[in-house]
């Protein structure tokens, strides 16, 4: 069975979050997709969405968020550039399928942004999460205001027993620190 999990990314201010959400391409290839933030006890808030119908590998930029939908692969790429401490939070990808409720994709992303020391000795200058180039074409897409009350979530369990960390032999120094946490609904 598919488990709903969280993946935790710990990044510094100014870096870039670069993630992907996969979906069933036969069902959702051209459906409109969105990137949402979930604040405890609140309804998810849509921050950016693809066009409707979603265009293949056509970047859509809304502020510091770039979405790119690879239809033929069933992958939505999400980049949040120039991260700020206040970007910290829980995020998810959803697929709009009106009149039905949005379809939530796996996994959720727990983003933790901390103050950085860019440019000072010892700073992680070559972190891949700093990499960002402006896509050749960007478009602003209008997102439906519809959010489903059913996707309101509780905070994940605080128990550390269910936290699995990446394999010990992987050096995550220049990747990103990721922790998978099962989410129980």
């Amino acid at each position: 069975a598919t488990k709903l999990t969280e993946e935790k990314y710990e990044l510094k201010e100014g870096q870039t979050l670069d993630v992907k959400c996969d979906y069933t391409l036969e069902k959702f290839a051209s459906s409109q997709k969105a990137w949402q933030i979930i604040r405890d006890g609140e309804m998810p808030k849509t921050l950016a969405c693809t066009e409707r119908p979603s265009k293949n590998s056509h970047p859509v930029q809304v502020g510091r968020i770039i979405l790119e939908d690879y239809h033929d692969h069933g992958l939505l790429r999400v980049r949040m550039v120039n991260l700020q401490v206040e970007d910290s939070g829980l995020y998810q990808c959803v697929i709009y399928q009106p009149p039905k409720e949005p379809h939530m994709l796996f996994d959720r992303i727990r983003l933790v942004v901390t103050k950085g020391f860019s440019g000072t000795p010892g700073s992680n200058e070559n972190s891949t999460q700093n990499v960002y180039k402006i896509p050749p074409t960007t478009t602003k897409a209008l997102c439906p205001l519809y959010t489903s009350p059913r996707t309101v979530t509780q905070a994940p369990p605080k128990s550390t027993a269910d936290v699995s960390t990446p394999d010990s032999e992987i050096n995550l120094t220049n990747v990103t620190d990721i922790i998978r946490v099962p989410v129980f609904n």
Epitope: S57, D107, V175, I178
Partner: antibody
């Protein structure tokens, strides 16, 4: 330690199908995407596609889209790649590969490789 | 699709030599580039990820640099076990593609 163990060599006739298995151990199978890469004898590496073992979703390059099926059995931590309508050009070593980062990361760095499965297509 | 062009396609060198291989992308791929080593009859091995980061356990004589379209892979002092074929691979977008490979032979 992370290990990907693939099924043995296969000889197939043109038009037939082949199903290669890839058994994972040493990590949580559903946490990392599995990719498939092939290499014809004396040739370079060719990416075929990916599969997320947690969701079961997969994607493949246009060249293979109508012929390849990627599946998994999470109960035995095994991924499968089936290629149909085989032709002589499909003769190659097929590798299953695990990425460096978790499924959600846009990090297509092929860190752990299976030993490869030689598929020979000949009449 | 992004084309990755490696040069040279083959190279002869001696133990102790400094060796450089280049990889050129058909368009800007930022730092989304990896390097692999493959020995005959074996699976490839990840050496460098994100253009310049050394994979855990890989000797420090291997290094990578570059960004945008031009990348360089260097072995500072060639060892007998380094004779192999080397591949670059981009992941700036889908589909992922590899260079055609550089075969490093003993002179």
């Amino acid at each position: 330690q992370v290990q990907l163990v693939q099924s043995g060599a296969e000889v197939k006739k043109p038009g037939a199908s082949v199903k290669v298995s890839c058994k994972a151990s040493g990590y949580t199978f559903t946490s990392y995407d599995i990719n498939w890469v092939r290499q014809a004898t004396g040739q370079g590496l060719e990416w075929m596609g990916w599969m997320n073992p947690n969701s079961g979703n997969s994607g493949s390059v246009k060249k293979f889209r109508d012929r390849v099926t990627m599946t998994r059995d999470t109960s035995i931590s095994t991924a499968y790649m089936e290629l149909s309508s085989l032709r002589s050009e499909d003769t190659a070593v097929y590798y299953c590969v695990r990425l460096i980062g978790y499924s959600s990361a846009w990090k297509w760095s092929f860190q752990h490789w299976g030993q490869g499965t030689l598929v020979t297509v000949s009449s | 699709d992004i084309q990755m062009t490696q040069s040279p396609s083959s190279l002869s060198a001696s133990v102790g030599d400094r060796v450089t291989i280049t990889c050129q992308a058909s368009r800007d791929i930022s730092k989304y580039l990896n390097w692999y080593q493959q020995k005959p009859g074996k699976a490839p091995k990840l050496l460098i990820y994100d253009a310049s980061n050394l994979e855990t356990g890989v000797p420090s004589r291997f290094s990578g640099s570059g960004s945008g379209t031009d990348f360089t892979f260097t072995i500072s002092s060639l060892q007998p076990e380094d004779f192999a074929t080397y591949y670059c691979q981009h992941y700036d977008n889908i589909p992922i593609t590899f260079g055609q490979g550089t075969r490093l032979e003993i002179k």
